[in-house]
Interface confidence: medium
């Protein structure tokens, strides 16, 4: 089943997010991902937890998952590199780098996204864009076309309140508001983009979606710059 957790959003402008990837298992959407280099997609480590012996591939240049589109191309995965400290039972270090079988053919609909290297928190209240093919309602309806939503960044102290995530949000994580608008199941691994720069990756825990007291949790990519660089080197 798709992992992660866009509720309350709308259909994205087709191909306006050329960095967007669909990580697929046996031909079906599993998680989001973001093209960070010609041959590398960043996603969430937990996405492959249940992949077992299945075929993992990455779809780039897509808006619709099912309809033919000239820019769409499915790439095999040459190599899957989870963060060495990621573990199935925690949300920490939930990052995965997927090396494509070949360099992606770049164009208007396929383009890597610059990612944040300066390890500084995004200012609370900043509106950031999150996109994905995750479920769009509590009944679990999966969209065929890419959805997106703008979410304000939530300060860590509020996110760590006992009524919210109760201290689980480390300096390497960030939160965004989740009041009816939220990332949801199937969005895991997808990008949180602030000011045209990748700031976060949707974590793949089994958090309830759309509840303001359970804000969305995102892995801060700047905190993992050294690891990302070492893998891409």
């Amino acid at each position: 089943p798709p992992r992660g957790r866009i509720l309350g959003g709308r259909e994205a402008e087709a191909h306006a997010r050329p960095y967007m990837a669909s990580v697929q298992l046996n031909g079906a959407h599993l998680c989001g991902g973001v093209l960070v280099a010609e041959q590398w997609v960043l996603s969430a480590a937990h996405c492959l937890e249940d992949a077992a012996d299945g075929k993992v591939q990455v779809l780039l240049g897509a808006h619709s998952l099912s309809q033919p589109e000239p820019s769409k191309r499915l790439y095999d995965v040459l190599r899957a590199v989870p963060h060495p400290d990621s573990q199935p039972d925690t949300i920490d270090h939930d990052l995965l780098l997927l090396q494509l079988s070949e360099k992606a053919t770049l164009g208007p609909a396929v383009r890597p996204l610059p990612w944040q290297r300066v390890d500084r928190d995004v200012a609370p209240g900043t509106l950031c864009d999150v996109a994905g093919w995750g479920i769009v309602n509590h009944a679990g309806r999966r969209p065929d076309s890419l959805q997106h939503v703008l979410l304000p960044v939530l300060d860590r102290a509020t996110c760590n309140r006992r009524t919210h995530h109760d201290g689980a949000i480390t300096e390497r994580l960030m939160c965004a508001e989740s009041n009816r608008r939220d990332s949801c199941k199937g969005d895991s691994g997808g990008p949180l983009v602030c000011g045209g720069v990748l700031e976060g990756v949707v974590t793949s825990g089994s958090r309830v979606c759309g509840n303001r007291k359970k804000p969305g949790i995102y892995t801060r990519v700047a905190s993992y710059a050294a690891w990302i660089d070492s893998v891409l080197a």
């Epitope: 249940d50 077992a52 012996d53 299945g54 075929k55 040459l78 190599r79 090396q99």
Partner: antibody, heavy 120, light 112 residues
């Protein structure tokens, strides 16, 4: 609960045959590659055989020491793994473990093992 | 076949000490896909083996962070920062990069 349970071990004469079985439960058996690993008395571990899932055409792989004598197979409808062992040798005497394999190829679920003794 | 050589054969330690186990492969165990399928397993007396580390340095679920895997190419190390009584047993390295897959001979961690 995720588990695998081996059965079918026993005493067999050299050049004889034996079929080991492994019943899996608590997970989607058909999506996992499965393996047999053995351990001779007082010795280390030895990988024996692997069979991949249907999406990977049930591809099989064997250790050189058992090639052409052992056959690994699976029945996804019954969540069952088997190891048919023919032309057994005394050096095949071991505890045989049924082992599940995760996406990163690691052996994450092991059974408690079934003992095979080859002796005249 | 890839030969996996573990040293030492036996490692006597005091509780709380650091332990280090070496595993050397007879050839590079970098798979053609770029991953290095080097794992570490612990087998406690009378039990089945349990996975500790996969792809050289990734700790498996529930494995304490005092266990650290490192290395590349042909040389790999498992370090246990503060040995506890529950860590005693036989440690095996394993390569899953080249068929036939092979285990190291094992290292017995015991109390000094």
């Amino acid at each position: 609960e995720v588990q695998v349970v081996e059965s079918g071990g026993g005493l067999v004469r050299p050049k004889g045959s034996l079929k080991l079985s492994c019943a899996a439960s608590g997970f989607s058996f058909n999506t996992y590659a499965m393996n047999w690993v053995r351990q001779a008395p007082g010795k280390g571990l030895e990988w024996v055989a692997r069979i991949r899932s249907k999406s990977n055409n049930y591809a099989t792989y064997y250790a050189d020491s058992v090639k052409d004598r052992f056959t690994i197979s699976r029945d996804d409808s019954e969540s069952m793994l088997s190891l048919q062992m023919n032309n057994l040798k005394t050096e095949d005497t071991a505890m045989y473990y049924c082992v599940r394999q995760g996406y990163y190829w690691y052996f994450d679920v092991w059974g408690t093992g079934t003992t095979v003794t080859v002796s005249s | 076949d890839v030969l996996m050589t573990q040293t030492p054969l036996s490692l006597p330690v005091s509780l709380g000490d650091q332990a280090s186990i070496s595993c050397r492969s007879s050839q590079s165990i970098v798979h053609s896909n770029g991953n290095t399928y080097l794992e570490w397993y612990l087998q406690k007396p009378g039990q089945s083996p349990k996975l500790l580390i996969y792809t050289v340095s990734n700790r498996f679920s529930g494995v304490p962070d005092r266990f650290r895997g490192s290395g590349s190419g042909t040389d790999f190390t498992l370090k246990i920062s503060r040995v506890e009584a529950e860590d005693l047993g036989v440690y095996y390295c394993f390569q899953g990069s080249h068929v036939p897959w092979t285990f190291g001979g094992g290292t017995k961690l015991e109390i000094k």
